[in-house]
């Protein structure tokens, strides 16, 4: 299965300020905030699927170190 990009460092913008482990980089405000303040992907029970129109992101395809919760502290830069 394809995986998303693993970092927010890229050619179009300077690297964001690294966040501490419990924080995630919020692109809209461009600084680190507690990850709990952002709607990070949550694992779904096996076999569960979201009905349209509320289709959730697939945690296993989100950026991050592994499957499951896969909430990436974006500037943590794995």
């Amino acid at each position: 299965m394809r995986r998303g990009p693993r970092s927010l460092r890229g050619r179009d913008a300077p690297a964001p300020t690294p966040c501490v482990p419990a924080e995630c980089f919020d692109l809209l405000v461009r600084h680190c905030v507690a990850c709990g303040l952002l709607r990070t992907p949550r694992p779904k029970p096996a076999g569960a699927s979201s009905p349209a129109p509320r289709t959730a992101l697939q945690p296993q395809e989100s950026v991050g170190a592994g499957a499951g919760e896969a909430a990436l502290p974006l500037p943590g830069l794995l």
């Epitope: 998303g4 990009p5 690297a15 959730a56 950026v63 974006l74």
Partner: antibody
Framework: EVQLQESGPGLVKPSQTLSLTCTVS????????WNWIRQHPGKCLEYIGY???????YYNPSLKSRVTISRDTSKNQYSLKLSSVTAADTAVYYC????????????WGQGTLVTVSS | DIVLTQSPATLSLSPGERATLSCRAS??????????MNWFQQKPGQAPRLLIY???NRATGIPARFSGSGSGTDFTLTISSLEPEDFAVYYC?????????FGCGTKVEIK
């Protein structure tokens, strides 16, 4: 399972204020971004704005002078007010929320049609 | 604002055929190594449904026949073999910066 449900009058008179509420279940509006989007009949989707986890707001500059988005965290609801409406504001209004970290709107309400007419 | 232009406006195809939809942005939607381009499907009377996020990642429950590609300013949504339920309007949307903007859609209709 996150669910969003719009509610409010389906008919508003010209020059009055359109008021809609989005009730959220399955997640707290003190986390994430909570948006309003509208779609004119048979036309494109237009982004209105958001209220964030902190209560800060962003309004599309094209509508900024007429828009207010607020929230009631005790009811887990957020609201849209659009003042001085005209027939051009007739549209289906959606509330929606993007996930992190891609800010892709994966949760949507079913939409509510608001007609501006006298 | 970032303007998204979709083409063609209408695509007339038969079930089983391949659909290729294009979306071009007025400026790059890439940031931090991610393409902030998303694709939605909308059927009459329904809300948009997220199909693809970050240019190429399928959302939960979306069949493998849907795929997305592209980076920078040029993006493509491909439906490898159209099923009857795929006839709908498809929108691209950028989430690189606010105001988030949408294309005006490509209608995939039955030929």
């Amino acid at each position: 399972e996150v669910q969003l449900q719009e509610s409010g009058p389906g008919l508003v008179k010209p020059s009055q204020t359109l008021s809609l509420t989005c009730t959220v279940s399955g997640d707290s509006i003190t986390s994430g971004y909570w948006n309003w989007i509208r779609q004119h009949p048979g036309k494109c989707l237009e982004y209105i704005g958001y209220i964030s986890y902190s209560g800060s707001t962003y309004y599309n500059p094209s509508l900024k002078s007429r828009v207010t988005i607020s929230r009631d965290t005790s009811k887990n609801q957020y609201s849209l007010k659009l003042s001085s409406v005209t027939a051009a504001d007739t549209a289906v209004y959606y509330c929606a929320s993007p996930n992190y970290p891609f800010y892709a709107m994966d949760y949507w309400g079913q939409g509510t049609l608001v007609t501006v007419s006298s | 604002d970032i303007v998204l232009t979709q083409s063609p406006a209408t695509l007339s195809l038969s079930p089983g055929e391949r659909a290729t939809l294009s979306c071009r942005a007025s400026e790059s939607v890439d940031n931090y190594g991610i393409s902030f381009m998303n694709w939605f499907q909308q059927k009459p009377g329904q809300a948009p449904r997220l199909l693809i996020y970050a240019a190429s990642n399928r959302a939960t429950g979306i069949p493998a026949r849907f795929s997305g590609s592209g980076s920078g300013t040029d993006f493509t949504l491909t439906i490898s073999s159209l099923e009857p339920e795929d006839f709908a309007v498809y929108y691209c949307q950028q989430s690189k910066e606010v105001p988030w903007t949408f294309g005006c859609g490509t209608k995939v209709e039955i030929k």
